[in-house]
């Protein structure tokens, strides 16, 4: 039950996170005009990954796409790439995780396959979240650098009578959306990975093999050695002395990728 809840919650958190990453990528407010020097501007500038916009006091808003690829800063291209990779990985992860959900029955899909898929989607969510966080952080770093460069420029060459006010940009709403969304996707991915460990079988389902030796019979049951999950009881190699009778495990177990023949 706890596994199902963890998996379901991981899926929902990741879904919200990926929706947030998509929203952040599409948003125009990655950087917004810094209003520190002119809080009552009649013209407000803001920029996104795909276009830059100007909103006037009149209510008129004009947006222009970046119709060049080669003319754009390499950092901007890198941020675009990171965000797109994050979205693609997240989308694939969502698709995989839907089929991996314990509450959804698809044919005779075994738990081992579901565990595999849960782990795969979890890793995808983690990488997706990291891509988003990295993309937003690179853009934020670029903004900080440009901000201080333009601040330095503002206070140089002002000997003349005419002032040229340089537009400085600061963090836009999309950065915060991106950071939060990336974090949620990452958390969702971690939850999926934890759920995967719980989905893996508790015990192996090999029958004990009887060896009839002279004197008295001893049945040996090889133990299934799986990675410790932290869920359920510890797997033990059991020696069962039962006068040559075949024995079954006390706990019913399911086939697993960790079972070896």
């Amino acid at each position: 039950m706890a596994v199902t809840a963890c998996q379901g919650l991981g899926f929902v958190v990741s879904l919200i996170g990926i929706a947030g990453i998509i929203a952040a990528t599409c948003m125009d407010q990655w950087s917004t005009q810094d209003l520190y020097n002119n809080p009552v501007t009649a013209v407000f500038n803001y920029q996104g990954l795909w276009r830059s916009c100007v909103r006037e006091s009149s209510g008129f808003t004009e947006c222009r796409g970046y119709f060049t690829l080669l003319g754009l800063p390499a950092m901007l291209q890198a941020v675009r790439a990171l965000m797109i990779v994050g979205i693609v990985l997240g989308a694939i992860g969502l698709l995989v995780s839907i089929f991996a959900l314990k509450c959804i029955r698809i044919g005779s899909m075994e738990d081992s396959a579901k565990a595999n898929m849960t782990l795969t989607s979890g890793i995808m969510f983690i990488v997706s979240g990291l891509c988003a966080i990295a993309g937003v952080s690179v853009f934020a770093n670029m903004l900080v650098t440009n901000f201080w460069m333009s601040t330095a420029n503002m206070y140089t060459g002002m000997g003349g009578m005419v002032q040229t006010v340089q537009t400085r940009y600061t963090f836009g709403a999309a950065l915060f959306v991106g950071w939060v969304a990336g974090g949620l996707t990452l958390i969702g991915g971690v939850m999926m990975c934890i759920a995967c460990r719980g989905l893996a079988p508790e015990e192996t389902n090999y029958k004990a093999v009887s060896y009839h030796a002279s004197g008295h019979s001893v049945a040996y049951k090889p133990g299934g050695f799986k990675a410790s999950t932290g869920f359920g009881s510890n797997t033990k190699n059991k020696k069962i002395y039962d006068g040559g009778a075949r024995t079954e495990d006390e706990v019913q177990s399911y086939p697993s990728k960790h079972d070896y023949v």
């Epitope: 009552v40 009649a42 013209v43 009149s58």
Partner: antibody, heavy 118, light 113 residues
Framework: DVNLVESGGGLVKPGGSLKLSCAAS????????MSWVRQTPEKRLEWVAT????????YYLDSVKGRFTISRDNAKNTLYLQMSSLRSEDTAMYYC???????????WGLGTSVTVSS | DIVMTQSPSSLTVTAGEKVTMSCKSS????????????LTWYQQKPGQPPKLLIY???TRESGVPDRFTGSGSGTDFTLTISGVQGEDLAVYYC?????????FGGGTKLELK
């Protein structure tokens, strides 16, 4: 056709109050940013205040800040300018204007005269 | 505040003549975001409210004759009337539309000889 009609002007003593109104017609009033601009007896134009289309922001000339209040009633298609603590330098013709692209004022009313004198 | 300075304060011309008037701002009115200059020109005839002629420094308002041309960028702007007509006799004002307070120039009065 766009039509702006100002009213409420008149003669008032220094320190007195006056409320100007601007009735708008011929356009979707709620979708436009509106402003008040005054013209002094010396024919100098002076922007007074602006209220954005969504009533989100209001902007004022420093010399009128705290004394004048711009507001709008989108249901009545009316723009207001509440003026208090009036001074002699507030004597002017007050125009109601509509703001368009480029923050330009494309439509002006005929104005209402405000005289502050003892 | 951005200070707008217009020159000359008055111009005496003959009909059909080409006229240019200047407007200078204390700060650049060029917005880097859209590369547009937030300068507007108005015409005011006696006894009438001002009328919008040109916005974004060079964009003519609909219905304005094409003899009116706005030019310039940054801090220096010009309004040119090619072939002045009697109906053009008025006071011309430039305005900063870039930042509050929205300031006007002192005006240029156009008179006929």
């Amino acid at each position: 056709d766009v039509n702006l009609v100002e009213s409420g002007g008149g003669l008032v003593k220094p320190g007195g109050s006056l409320k100007l109104s601007c009735a708008a017609s011929g356009f979707t009033f709620s979708s436009y940013t509106m402003s008040w601009v005054r013209q002094t007896p010396e024919k100098r134009l002076e922007w007074v205040a602006t209220i954005t289309y969504g009533r989100i922001y209001t902007y004022y000339l420093d010399s009128v800040k705290g004394r004048f209040t711009i507001s709008r009633d989108n249901a009545k298609n009316t723009l207001y300018l509440q003026m208090s603590s009036l001074r002699s330098e507030d004597t002017a013709m007050y125009y109601c204007t509509r703001m368009i692209t480029g923050n330009a004022m494309d439509s002006w009313g005929l104005g209402t005269s405000v005289t502050v004198s003892s | 505040d951005i200070v707008m300075t217009q020159s000359p304060s008055s111009l005496t011309v003959t009909a059909g003549e080409k006229v240019t008037m200047s407007c200078k701002s204390s700060q650049s009115l060029l917005n880097s975001g859209n590369q547009k200059n937030y300068l507007t020109w108005y015409q005011q005839k006696p006894g009438q409210p001002p009328k919008l002629l040109i916005y974004w420094a060079s964009t003519r308002e609909s219905g304005v004759p094409d003899r009116f041309t706005g030019s310039g960028s940054g801090t220096d702007f010009t309004l040119t009337i090619s072939g002045v007509q009697g109906e053009d006799l008025a006071v011309y004002y430039c305005q900063n539309d870039y930042s509050y307070p929205l300031t006007f120039g002192g005006g240029t009065k156009l008179e006929l000889k």
